[in-house]
Every structure is written in structure tokens, then in C-alpha cells.
């Protein structure tokens, strides 16, 4: 690593990449952009997928947290030979398909999509792309778009969650490197710590959840703190306050000493969750403490 900023969030990250004919001479820049970004998402709970689209969508690498598989996926990505039309909706559909399968059996992991394209979408193709991006959103995904060169920012703002979820790169493909920091900052939702991390058994507490990106939700009213108790029961609580770098949440009352609550955050009212390694434990507190 080069010591640059990193993201510790545990979620599912999908790269949807334009490999149409117009990017033929710029694939190296796209690849390098993805490679740099991929190495900055470092949570062991983060899974990644690479999807490319031209006249159809292809899943080059299905979701995996295995760093060796991700390395191999990046090698596959580097070998891509661009060509064909800009059927962006085909890429979104491949992402939605994965999100559906992965979240169909109980625990639902939050999904973040970073879609990159270089051209304006003709009317029908824009309609299809917006429709498929909406389907990904219906399945709980947060959608970001990176537009390079001849993109239409208004279109991308409708495909992405909002205009704040669009990263315009007006200076051509070589300028992609320049947005890595900002895209990382905006797309990263991470839980870093809880204060206090030890609470008294049987008592009510408030917990400050430290992290980043909590206001990246489309609607901050839908942010929830979630406590997975002893790896079984999950309790969701509405935070008292939502700021970008912290949440103030009521902690569940944990009756017994030694109980553990793993901290998660939902950005969409419990549809899916960002996981973390942050644990709250209970201890015995005497009356005087």
C-alpha cells in the first residue's frame, strides 16, 4: 500500500465498467483506476465484483472477499479488449442479479455500485439504464456514477442516487487518478469504533458510533444502528443523531455479563447492513460505579 486513504467498511462493492468501443484506447487508465481503488477497500468483510458492459453485460468476477481471487479478477480485467455498444443497463442487471442471489437467504449485506461510462446514452439506452439502476436500488444498493469525457451529467445524476453521487471527470481518462481520493471518501461507509465499547449489564446506555459516510444515505431518516447480539438476535435502533462521522444511538439493554453485540449500520431502514469488527460487551457494574 502507498499509505493513501483506505476504507474499512464491510459491504459488497460492485464495479460496473464501460468496455464499449469508445474506450478502446483508454482501457489501461480504466483498469489502473479500478486497481488503485480496489486496493483501498481493505476490510476482510468487504466483497468485490467486477462487471463489464458493452453490447451485453458480463460478470468478470463474482462477489468475493478472497484477496487472491480479487488479484486474479484484476488480471482478467486488465486483459479486457473493449468493443461494442454502451448498454449500461446490461451491467446494472448483472449487479442486481448478484445482489438478489446474495441477499436471498437471510443476512443482507449493503451494496455499493460504482459505475463508469464515457459516453452519452441514447434515449432508449438511458431509459433502460435508469430502470435497471432503480432495480439495483430497490434491492438496497447505493449507486455512484463516474462520467469521463463525453458523458451527460444530467443522465448520470438520474442513474446514480443523486447528482452528489456523480463524479465528473472532464479532463479525459488520464484524470481518473485524480478522483480516487474523493470517490473513496464518498463511497466509503465504515464503522470504526463505539464509545463506550463496554456497557453495564442490565442498564440503558447511549452509544456513539464513530466512522465515516453515515450521511451518504439517500435519506438520513432511514439510517439505523443495528446490534447483532451473541451472533443470533438482531436489534435495530433509530439513532438520535446522524452526522457524517458519527451516530448517536440508543444501545439495547443487555441483561447478562459477557454478552456481546456486534455493531452494524443500515442506510436503508434495515433492507441491508454494513458490517464491522466493532463489538460492544457487557460487564458487571456495582451500584457505586
Amino acid at each position: 500500500e502507498d499509505g493513501g486513504p483506505a476504507c474499512y467498511g464491510g459491504f459488497d462493492l460492485y464495479f460496473i465498467l464501460d468496455k464499449s468501443g469508445s474506450v478502446l484506447h483508454h482501457w489501461n487508465e480504466i483498469y489502473y483506476f479500478v486497481e488503485q481503488l480496489a486496493h483501498r477497500f481493505i476490510s476482510p468483510q468487504l466483497r468485490m465484483s467486477f462487471i463489464v458492459f458493452s453490447t451485453r453485460g458480463t460478470t468478470l468476477m463474482k462477489l468475493t472477499e478472497d484477496r487472491e481471487q480479487i488479484r486474479q479478477g484484476l488480471e482478467e480485467l486488465q486483459k479486457v479488449l473493449p468493443g461494442g455498444d454502451t448498454y449500461m443497463h446490461e451491467g446494472f442487471e448483472r449487479a442486481s442479479e448478484q445482489i438478489y442471489y446474495e441477499n436471498s437467504q437471510g443476512y443482507r449485506t449493503a451494496s455499493v455500485i460504482i459505475a463508469l461510462t464515457d459516453g452519452e446514452l441514447h434515449e432508449d439506452l438511458f431509459f433502460y439504464s435508469e430502470r435497471e439502476a432503480n432495480r439495483s436500488r430497490d434491492l438496497g444498493a447505493i449507486v455512484y456514477c463516474v462520467g469521463v469525457k463525453d458523458f451527460n451529467e444530467t443522465q448520470l445524476a438520474r442513474i446514480a442516487d443523486s447528482k452528489d453521487h456523480v463524479f465528473p471527470v472532464n479532463d479525459g481518462f488520464q484524470a481518473l487518478q485524480g478522483i480516487i481520493h474523493s470517490i473513496l471518501k464518498k463511497s466509503c461507509i465504515e464503522i470504526l469504533a463505539a464509545e463506550p465499547s463496554t456497557i453495564c449489564a442490565g442498564e440503558s446506555f447511549q452509544v456513539v458510533v464513530r466512522g465515516n459516510g453515515f450521511r451518504h444515505a439517500r435519506n438520513v431518516d432511514r439510517v439505523l444502528c443495528s446490534f447483532k447480539i451473541n451472533d443470533s438476535v438482531t436489534l435495530n435502533e433509530k439513532p438520535f443523531a446522524v452526522e457524517d462521522t458519527y451516530l448517536l444511538c440508543p444501545a439495547p439493554i443487555l441483561k447478562e455479563v459477557g454478552m456481546k453485540a456486534a455493531l452494524q449500520v443500515s442506510m436503508n431502514d434495515g433492507l441491508s447492513f454494513i458490517s464491522s469488527s466493532v463489538i460492544i460487551t457487557t460487564t458487571h457494574c456495582s451500584d457505586g460505579s
Partner: antibody, heavy 121, light 107 residues
Framework: QVQLQQSGPGLVKPSQTLSLTCAIS??????????WGWIRQSPGRGLEWLGR?????????DYAVSVKSRITINPDTSKNQFSLQLNSVTPEDTAVYYC???????????WGQGTLVTVSS | DIELTQPPSVSVAPGQTARISCSGD??????AHWYQQKPGQAPVLVIY???KRPSGIPERFSGSNSGNTATLTISGTQAEDEADYYC?????????FGGGTKLTVLG
Amino acid sequence: QVQLQQSGPGLVKPSQTLSLTCAISGDSVSTNGAAWGWIRQSPGRGLEWLGRIYYRSKWYNDYAVSVKSRITINPDTSKNQFSLQLNSVTPEDTAVYYCARMPGGFLFDLWGQGTLVTVSS
Amino acid sequence: DIELTQPPSVSVAPGQTARISCSGDNIRSYYAHWYQQKPGQAPVLVIYGDSKRPSGIPERFSGSNSGNTATLTISGTQAEDEADYYCSSYASHDYVFGGGTKLTVLG
């Protein structure tokens, strides 16, 4: 428990229109996460997907290329059912026709009982 | 679009492991689903998304997908598993099915 009940004639004359209906119980045709589709099965062609409809704030459909010019799938929200119409049929369209639920729109997790449709004069 | 090829038939002794293959160019890039169909009945989904089992399907059914082959594995095959099995995949607004494999449980 979700069930799909198919109805429609078992015999259709060549050049006429094949019409089948699939009544849904225990779910809604307008469910935002699902699609509803038709598949047919014949000895010569195996299983063949024909098309699907789904609701995402408005109705959409997708049809298989092989039948695109002849097929219509429509929802009937008042009766909670959907229908298949296949125009200009030939003996090649003789098959068992199934309706199916498609959660997420990507697979068929529940099938109707099937209707054998014979195209013959 | 992807074409899916299955062996027409597979035989297995009761209690043994049956493996049914489904080959297609780079099928690992797609998700494979498997349907079981008994005579006179509609197909039933037994595996979806390469390896996921719907509720109600016995644990002896499992799936995998790598390279150019998806595989349905039935461990400890029982007489009631005798049926036709179809693989399927979703590709660019099209649903593709394999030709089907007749599984015979011997004895």
C-alpha cells in the same frame, strides 16, 4: 402458500391466437420485487422461455426473440392474474405451457401446473 | 447468447453420489440454476445462484460453477431423486435452458 393456477383451451387452430391465463393466490401480480413469466416445453425444443412482465411503478415486459413479433403478456390487477397471447400459431407451437413466478426477475421459483396446448386443424 | 449442454442421461446406485454437468462457454460468468422435473409434473427449483438451496430442498442437493462447467451434485442419492434435471441461466434478457439430463437411480 403461493399458488399459480393456469386456465385456457387445450386445442388451437393454426393461424389463430393461443390464449392462456395464470391466476395468482398468496401473492400479488404487482409485487415490486417479482416478475411473472411464461415458459413452454416440447419434445423438440425442450424448455423455452417466452416472456415476462413486472411492475416497477409502471408495467414492463421482456419477450424472447424467437416469439417477439407474436407475443403479448398482460397483467390483470383486478383479478390478480396475468395472461399470455401468442398470435398466428403453427403446429410448431404445440407444447406444454407453464406460467411461473420470477423473484427478482432472474429465476423461476414457482410454476403453474402446466397446460398442454395442441395446434391442429 | 450462451448455449448450455447437458449429458442426456446419468445413472447412479442408491446411496451413491450423482453428478450432472452443464457446460457452456465461460459459464462461470453466469449464474447457474437447476430444476428437477418428474413425469407429468412442473419443474421444481432445486439450486439457484450456482450453489444456493431453496427452503424445502434436501441438503443432499448442492451446486458449483467454475470454468466452463456448472455441476449439480446429489449426495446419497435416493430413489425419489429419479427425474429429469435442467440447468438454466439468465443472459441478457434471455433465459437459457440446457437440454435436460435423465437421472436413473439403479436397483
